[in-house]
Interface confidence: medium
């Protein structure tokens, strides 16, 4: 069985389908360009008690009297945006904790960096691929997941913390990167567009996709995520864009069914378990890999960052329910919760297949112009 | 500010109908679900029915069948319409916007003042 | 249908005291399906607490909101004069089907 959007049809899609960049090209970031804060209108994150900050929450860290192997982390500052004048009371409903707390948005002020510093950093995500500059290392293995079909009990919770939709993952879910790179699962969230807007956070030669799927784990040399956050590999996110296609996405249906209980800002539902690998491409052999960060505050560096080269299908009516489903705080929808692309700053992305023969369709003739960092290894 | 405001409310005899309305002024009713309360004389509060910024519609198994919750959006108005109406009906009918937009949670504000519906012969 | 116990139904304490309403779900339900109301005699109620835990912006710290799964609580720190009133929880599910009751409501009194 063929499998859709292989890369011998071109790189993700080689920008074939999918939006226009809603950026355009003169608006990604160069070489020179300092990190840049979010283009696209966004909400603001007014938390509920347990909301969590970074990509896009990850788990908080509990007291020490609580139990011991659970992994958590500390809320970090995000950054309030002002509330609508209309409507001050009901813009305003914040958890009781809210006084001490600032919040962060995407689109407008307060840039990032005042958030959390490591928002300037010189290696940050998401980044532009391209599959021609990619260096082929053959010492990048397919990816194994292990424990990723999950029995309908117990549920998991699916919530709408104000800037994604997450799905909070149970222990038990391991995932290697490689030999001696073993991680295991937290949570999986998305990042969408608007209508005839694509929203996806990583690019693939300037082209944006509808959608991305982020899997965020944590490295099994720690012990919680506060002692892995900007640690070189202490962190690792797999991520797959997200295509129109002619069929309904069964997987993706599980959850995108069930948007409609978490529309609003801060609530959650609970979903019977499911195959997570379902929501991933069948291809874990083919994939663009680099260190970058968290694509939200504390936008913390050290991030193994895996995006495959296989994109996901989901139907016109799904993609349109992902985008046009879920509301931020106030009267705002929860849409364009991407990060502007981020300056490479010599970074080298490897790719575990030669993405540079044959590959693009904007290609004159092919070209490998950087080698594998990894090769040795 | 936004306030809401019931009217419609009355004397009406069993099996009768009434439709309630419930204005609201400093905010734009559609993107929110809005809900009906009701409490009779001396009790407490009674859930009566819902309808999702969808215009999908729930409703109490008390009610179900008789009553209908619709919405005006172009008057910024919400409607209960209420059909074979019986004693156990009566009560002081409440109207309540969803504290944020879009979805279904169980957290309602602000609340109109009320308005009493008596069924009586 | 899903039923909210809630207990006590009365309760006198005096300006100070700490006071503790419990709210029980015949299911479990999401802690974002949870909220507390607070109605004074011939006015409407009044979101106290949403989501089991967080407050709306204008209702005072001494009110607080707990639980998870099919037991709520609401807790008023240091009551005070203006707490008399009758409070409500409310609970249920939005699914498939959309399932949600008030708890009978417990009438705070100060001595």
């Known amino acids: 069985q063929r499998l859709p959007r292989m890369q011998e049809d071109s790189p993700l899609g080689g920008g074939s389908s999918g939006e226009d960049d809603p950026l355009g090209e003169e608006d990604l970031p160069s070489e020179e360009d300092s990190p840049r804060e979010e283009d696209p209108p966004g909400e603001e994150d007014l938390p509920g008690e347990e909301d969590l900050p970074g990509e896009e929450d990850l788990p908080e860290v509990k007291p020490k009297s609580e139990e011991e192997g659970s992994l958590k982390l500390e809320d970090l500052p995000t950054v309030e945006a002002p509330g609508d004048p209309q409507e001050p009371q009901n813009n305003a409903h914040r958890d009781k904790e809210g006084d001490d707390q600032s919040h962060w948005r995407y689109g407008g002020d307060p840039p990032w960096p005042r958030v959390s510093p490591a928002c300037a950093g010189r290696f940050q995500s998401p980044v532009d691929i391209r599959p021609q500059l990619a260096a082929f290392c053959p010492a990048l293995r397919p990816l194994e997941l292990l424990g990723f079909q999950l029995p309908p009990l117990p549920e998991l919770r699916l919530r709408n913390n104000g800037h994604s939709v997450q799905l909070t993952l149970p222990p038990g879910l391991e995932m290697a990167l490689g030999p001696g790179r073993e991680y295991r699962a937290l949570q999986l969230h998305l990042h969408w567009g608007a209508a005839g807007r694509p929203g996806s956070e990583h690019t693939v030669e300037g082209h944006r996709f509808p959608a991305e799927i982020h899997v965020v784990h944590l490295s099994t040399a720690f012990a919680r995520v506060d002692e892995a956050l900007g640690r070189p590999g202490g962190l690792a996110v797999l991520a797959a864009f997200l295509e129109e296609g002619p069929e309904e996405n069964s997987a993706y249906e599980q959850l995108l069914s069930r948007l409609e209980e978490i529309a609003e800002e801060g609530s959650e539902t609970q979903v019977p378990g499911l195959d997570i690998s379902a929501l991933l491409p069948s291809d874990f052999s083919r994939y663009f890999q680099y260190e970058g960060s968290l694509t939200t505050p504390p936008c913390a560096q050290g991030v193994i960052w895996t995006v495959f080269n296989q994109t996901v299908m989901l139907s016109a009516k799904q993609l349109h329910t992902l985008s046009d489903t879920l509301w931020g705080p106030g009267d705002s929808r929860l849409q364009l919760n991407f990060r502007a692309t981020q300056p490479l700053n010599g970074r080298v992305i490897e790719a575990s297949f030669p993405a540079g023969v044959d590959s693009s369709p904007r290609a004159a003739e092919p070209v490998q112009l950087n080698s594998c960092l990894a090769a040795g290894d | 500010e936004v306030q809401l405001l019931e009217s419609g409310g009355g004397l009406v005899q069993p099996g009768g109908s009434l439709r309630l309305s419930c204005a609201a002024s400093g905010i734009d009713l559609s993107n929110y679900a809005m809900t009906w309360v009701r409490q009779a004389p001396g009790k407490g509060l009674e859930w009566v029915g819902i309808i999702s910024s969808n215009d999908k519609t729930w409703y109490a198994d008390s009610v179900k069948g008789r009553f209908t919750i619709s919405r005006d959006n172009s008057k910024n108005t919400l409607y209960l319409q209420m059909n074979s109406l019986r004693a156990e009906d009566t009560a002081v009918y409440y109207c309540?916007?969803?504290?944020?937009?879009?979805?279904?949670?169980?957290?309602?504000?602000?609340w109109g003042q009320g308005t009493l519906v008596t069924v009586s012969s | 249908d899903i039923q909210m116990t809630q207990s006590p139904s009365f309760l006198s304490a005096s300006v100070g005291d700490r006071v503790t309403i419990t709210c029980q779900a015949s299911q479990t339900i999401g802690g974002s399906d949870l909220s507390w109301y607070q109605q004074k005699p011939g006015k409407a109620p009044k979101l106290l607490i949403y989501y089991a835990t967080n407050l709306p912006s204008g209702v005072p710290s001494r009110f607080s909101g707990s639980g998870s799964g099919t037991d709520f609580t609401l807790t008023i720190s240091s009551l005070q004069c203006e707490d008399a009133a009758t409070y409500y929880c409310?609970?249920?599910?939005?699914?498939?089907?959309?399932?949600?009751?008030f708890g009978g409501g417990t009438k705070v009194e100060i001595k």
């Open positions: 409310l609970g249920g599910y939005a699914a498939a089907s959309y399932r949600t009751a």
């Open positions: 309540a916007k969803a504290a944020m937009p879009g979805g279904l949670k169980n957290a309602f504000d602000p």
